[in-house]
């Protein structure tokens, strides 16, 4: 079972890959961004629940196309290249979702603009972060 | 057949605590996040806490620091240490479990929690 | 905490009668929504999950549908097992929110 220091750690780590989240959010709906209409064209695949740690195998599998649509945003909008925002938040990933390789993401039947999957996303940080006990 | 039997309801004094627990049966118990819902007499239904596959625990605000989660993958079973207990925590106790994608599929019979003087 | 307002709060059918309950959400749920029957003294029932989709077992005449804030649960022909409570659900995120219940009487 988790320990406190691990509970801690996961709570650190949370709060870190939401700010990241929403550090890309804030990017992308800047005013000044010019490419923001032609992103909202992409779609992404939102997680059908998504409320355990387990669950961030759905925010992996999305990570690839989110680097290539945050390539053509102007990279003034972010304080690191999307390639480095974007591996920075695997590390992350990676680590709070464990290494239970066989547990296999299922996708809602809708898809999602990158703003609402960012949404999603910061969502389940902040509620994970208020109700990790 | 998925069975889960909830037990360890009763009669206790506010300030008091009670240890409720759930023996399941019928599935692979480890692979599963069970919760515990609660419903006060007359009223709807409330989430109160989770305890998922890797043992780590989610509840509300209402019972945060006196309610525990916990579970004995050994034993099929799943627990809820309830301490400071108040009036407003009177209910029938339901053990239900979450399916990985989707919502609680299974529930128990309910266990009766009295917090009365 | 998503609040989820369930609609009405009760209601009074006949058998045979079409019946619909309605849960509206405070923020977009796509589709993490079941729905839950509960007679008096018993645990509830899971009836539909995924906003649409039925359980094992659970009879035809009950559907579900919506996406995003409103969801509807339809009994098509009322019969007299389903005179019950039924809640509807989130589960898009912690904590899990439930609407106030609909309790379906006899006319």
């Known amino acids: 079972a988790p320990t406190s220091s691990s509970t801690k750690k996961t709570q650190l780590q949370l709060e870190h890959l939401l700010l990241d989240l929403q550090m890309i959010l804030n990017g992308i709906n800047n005013y000044k961004n010019p490419k923001l209409t032609r992103m909202l064209t992409f779609k992404f695949y939102m997680p059908k629940k998504a409320t355990e740690l387990k669950h961030l195998q759905c925010l992996e599998e999305e990570l690839k196309p989110l680097e290539e649509v945050l390539n053509l945003a102007q990279s003034k909008n972010f304080h690191l290249r999307p390639r480095d925002l974007i591996s920075n938040i695997n590390v992350i990933v990676l680590e709070l979702k464990g290494s239970e390789t066989t547990f296999m993401c299922e996708y809602a039947d809708e898809t999602a603009t990158i703003v609402e999957f960012l949404n999603r996303w910061i969502t389940f940080c902040q509620s994970i972060i208020s109700t990790l006990t | 057949e998925v069975q889960l039997v909830e037990s360890g309801g009763g009669l206790v004094q506010p300030g008091g605590s009670l240890r409720l627990s759930c023996a399941a049966s019928?599935?692979?118990?480890?692979?599963?996040?069970l919760a515990w819902v609660r419903q006060a007499p007359g009223k709807g239904l409330e989430w109160v806490a989770a305890?998922?596959?890797?043992?780590?625990?989610y509840s509300p605000d209402t019972v945060r620091g006196r309610f525990t989660i916990s579970r004995d993958n050994a034993k099929n079973s799943l627990y809820l240490q309830m301490n400071s207990l108040r009036a407003e925590d009177t209910a029938v106790y339901y053990c239900?479990?979450?399916?990985?994608?989707?919502?609680?599929?299974?529930w128990g019979q309910g266990t009766t929690v009295t917090v009365s003087s | 905490d998503i609040q989820m307002t369930q609609s009405p709060s009760s209601l009074s059918a006949s058998v045979g009668d079409r019946v619909t309950i309605t849960c509206k959400a405070r923020?977009?749920?796509?589709?993490?929504v079941a729905w839950y029957q509960q007679k008096p003294g018993k645990a509830p029932k899971s009836l539909i999950y995924s906003a649409s989709f039925r359980y094992s077992g659970v009879p035809s005449r009950f559907s579900g549908s919506g996406s995003g804030t409103d969801f509807t649960l339809t009994i098509s022909s009322l019969q007299p097992e389903d005179f019950a409570t039924y809640y509807c659900q989130q589960y898009y995120t912690y904590p899990y929110t439930f609407g106030g219940g609909t309790k379906v009487e006899i006319k």
């Open positions: 239900a479990r979450d399916s990985n994608w989707d919502a609680l599929d299974y």
């Open positions: 305890i998922d596959s890797s043992s780590y625990t």
């Open positions: 923020e977009k749920l796509w589709s993490a």
């Open positions: 019928g599935f692979t118990f480890s692979s599963y996040t």
